[in-house]
């Protein structure tokens, strides 16, 4: 998907919590410095997908990839190339 | 940068009512299957999430937001 | 057989209200997504509304938004179309339709199979 | 929303020809779309679901195809009871959109 080169740590994070795997999950949240506080609350995320299976997390990961690939996020991610196209040419 | 269709997803999930949130999800997928996950989903959450807990997952997310890794 | 039935429609002065109905027969209208559909005269199609089979989620077409709403009552098999604050062109035949799928992870999901005859609604001063 | 459009929008056919109708969806709708056929002064009647499936039914004449933004309805041999007009639907996501129609006339 286009639009997970532009935050990657969005979606290794989505992912690590959607996939209910929790050491990916703190290895992705060390990343963005996050704390105890945090952790413990996106952990509480995770437990609603575990809880809920393979299917629920099946399900929201399409919903995810589907907003993510939509004309809107697209459309943006043009705009954004277009905008730094414009930045590199003045820049030189 | 994030695309805001995502960041109004995610901010949805967190700080919105289920049906806003559904609401939204079902402008990109109408499925009734993938509706009724998303309102389990947002169900779940708001019950095991105090708003101390919210607070501090907004903040991870404006942590990921300002990432040089976004 | 399946049967859909709609009633309710008339003329009515803008800003007044009415209400649809729409009387299944022939299945098990509580395992069904239903809808509601209209068509202004010598006019397309256009989607009004969706409920759940319990009616835990309803969602309207954006020029009803805020006015219509959409309900159903499972023990007398009837759906219900409540329209509020009618406008000129809300002038229409109201179709209620069935979901084509009541089961599974189908693509039949969503797709309309069975069709009332419709009711007319004319508003006008 | 998703605009749906349909060409053409009028055509002139004689019984036993082969007609296609082209429906164009303005983002991907993967396979989620439906055709539908009506006749002056009566209710729509459904066709086809998730781009190729035909309603139960529905004659054997009638076929769609395509996915993502383009599809078509094929009438493979035209019946005198084929004349009306056909509209396509998305329902990938709300809220569900028609086309404008296309209106299958006696040339």
């Known amino acids: 998907v286009k639009m997970a080169e532009t935050c990657p740590i969005f979606y290794d994070v989505f992912f690590a919590v959607a996939n209910g795997n929790e050491l990916l999950l703190d290895l992705s949240l060390t990343k963005v410095n996050a704390t105890e506080p945090e952790r413990t609350a996106m952990k509480k995320i995770q437990d609603c997908y575990v809880e809920n299976g393979l299917i629920s997390r099946v399900l929201d990961g399409l919903v995810m990839t589907t907003i993510s690939s939509s004309k809107d996020c697209m459309g943006e991610a043009v705009q954004n190339t277009v905008e730094d196209l414009k930045l590199n040419t003045l820049g030189r | 940068e994030i695309c805001p269709a995502v960041k109004r997803d995610v901010d949805l999930f967190l700080t919105g009512t289920p049906d806003e949130y559904v609401e939204q999800v079902a402008q990109y997928k109408a499925l009734p299957v993938v509706l009724e996950n998303a309102r389990i989903l947002k169900n779940c959450v708001d019950a095991k999430m105090t708003e101390e807990d919210k607070e501090n997952a907004l903040s991870v997310l404006d942590k990921i937001y300002t990432s040089p890794l976004c | 057989q399946v049967q859909l039935v709609e009633s309710g429609g008339g003329v009515v002065l803008p800003g007044r209200s009415l209400r649809l109905s729409c009387a299944a027969s022939?299945?098990?209208?509580?395992?069904?997504?239903m809808y509601w559909v209209r068509q202004a005269p010598g006019k397309g199609l256009e989607w009004v509304a969706v409920i759940w089979y319990d009616g835990s989620n309803k969602f309207y077409g954006d020029s009803v938004k805020g006015r219509f709403t959409i309900s159903r009552d499972n023990s007398k098999n009837t759906l219900y179309l409540q329209m509020n604050s009618l406008r000129a062109e809300d002038t229409a035949v109201y179709y209620c339709?069935?979901?084509?799928?009541?089961?599974?992870?189908?693509?039949?999901?969503?797709?309309?199979?069975?069709w009332g005859q419709g009711t007319m609604v004319t508003v006008s001063s | 929303d998703i605009q749906m459009t349909q060409s053409p929008s009028s055509l002139s056919a004689s019984v036993g020809d082969r007609v296609t109708i082209t429906c164009r969806a303005s983002q991907d709708i993967y396979n989620y779309l439906a055709w539908f056929q009506q006749k002056p002064g009566k209710a729509p009647k459904s066709l086809i679901y998730a781009a190729s499936s035909l309603q139960t039914g529905v004659p054997s004449q009638f076929s769609g195809s395509g996915s993502g933004t383009d599809f078509t309805l094929t009438i493979s041999s035209l019946q005198p009871e084929d004349f009306a007009t056909y509209y396509c639907q998305q329902y990938n996501n709300y809220p569900f959109t028609f086309g404008p129609g296309t209106k299958v006339d006696i040339k």
């Open positions: 022939g299945f098990t209208f509580s395992s069904y997504l």
């Open positions: 339709a069935r979901d084509n799928g009541n089961s599974g992870y189908e693509d039949s999901w969503n797709a309309f199979d069975i």
